[in-house]
Interface confidence: medium
């Protein structure tokens, strides 16, 4: 491993649409991939009238937008669906919203869905 890089071997997995997609609903996802590729965790969620609804969480493969991010933070201003990615085992357990354009308004979700 490259010094200072946080290797991602597993991520929190969640799929709100699990019945339609025919997947697990929650669990811990082992992250596989080509040896020369970096691996990340991600989280996607919606903010419905102030209520946080998780859409998906899991592994995300080699995306430069995720490099060296130890925390899962969405910085886009008011997206329809929030997305963040990070490096490090289970780094997507918690995720936050810190828009770069406006006054900082953190929206975090420290709740960890229990594995099945």
């Amino acid at each position: 491993a490259i010094l200072g890089r946080s290797e991602t071997q597993e991520c929190l997995f969640f799929n709100a649409n699990w019945e339609r997609d025919r997947t697990n609903q929650t669990g811990v996802e082992p992250c596989y991939g080509d040896k020369d590729k970096r691996r990340h965790c991600f989280a996607t969620w919606k903010n419905i009238s102030g209520s946080i609804e998780i859409v998906k969480q899991g592994c995300w493969l080699d995306d430069i937008n995720c490099y060296d991010r130890t925390d899962c933070i969405e910085k886009k201003d008011s997206p329809e669906v929030y997305f963040c990615c990070c490096e490090g085992n289970m780094c997507n357990e918690k995720f936050s919203y810190f828009p770069e354009m406006e006054v900082t308004q953190p929206t975090s979700n420290p709740v960890t869905p229990k594995p099945p």
Epitope: N17, R20, T23, E29, Y32, L61, D63, I64
Partner: antibody
């Protein structure tokens, strides 16, 4: 090197059955979800079915639901597609493809395809 | 189901040209957007995944951009081996759906 090799295609009459196989090598087959995607002659790509890493979950396109069954044998590193009640519109090249993660971020490796022709 | 609309359906270009193909999803798919290249008689090959990430072995002249509903595949300087059909595909939810394809032909 990742390799996926489909077989089992051929000519079949409407209403008939066929079983496609996809032999996988070069990776730990039991770690990955797998898909079947088809392409009718001169047409675009159409997703057919998927199965998760251990066979516990399967999903189908509406067009094949109830007629096709996807399965896998991890001890043989092989993916299957059982096709029953075949129709002329099922005529296509069938590809097996590997899913990159549990939630199918992308299909990173594909086989060369096997042609299924449904005709009387 | 999420509908994927690609444009143009075909285009003619010369070696060295900059080529842009667009793909629109019927709802937000965040960055769950992939691009595949297919040559006649061959299997599709992954080119771009997660909207912007190049697959292994894909030349740097290929790039992807976009998020939400609008996405673009750009070939900065078209090479002879790039003449093919390109498909976008969403993997945000099942069923996985593909765009209709864009055939890149020699002018």
């Amino acid at each position: 090197e990742v390799q996926l090799l489909e077989s089992g295609g051929g000519l079949v009459q409407p209403g008939g059955s066929l079983r496609l196989s996809c032999a996988a090598s070069g990776f730990t087959f039991s770690d990955y979800g797998m898909h079947w995607v088809r392409q009718a002659p001169g047409k675009g790509l159409e997703w057919v079915a998927s199965i998760n890493y251990n066979g516990g979950y399967t999903s189908y396109a509406d067009s094949v639901k109830g007629r096709f069954t996807i399965s896998r044998d991890n001890s043989k590193n092989t993916l299957y597609l059982q096709m029953n009640s075949l129709r002329a519109e099922d005529t296509a090249v069938y590809y097996c493809a590997r899913a990159a993660t549990w939630h199918d971020t992308h299909l990173d490796y594909w086989g060369q395809g096997t042609l299924v022709t449904v005709s009387s | 189901d999420i509908q994927m609309t690609q444009s143009p359906s075909s285009l003619s270009a010369s070696v060295g040209d900059r080529v842009t193909i667009t793909c629109r999803a019927s709802q937000s798919i965040i960055t769950y957007l992939n691009w595949y290249q297919q040559k006649p008689g061959k299997a599709p090959k992954l080119v771009i995944y997660a909207a912007t990430s190049r697959a292994s072995g894909v030349p740097s002249r290929f790039s992807g951009s976009g998020s939400g509903t609008d996405f673009t595949l750009t070939i900065s300087s078209l090479q002879p081996e790039d003449f093919a059909t390109y498909y976008c595909q969403q993997s945000y939810e099942s069923p996985l759906t593909f765009g209709g394809g864009t055939k890149v032909e020699i002018k």
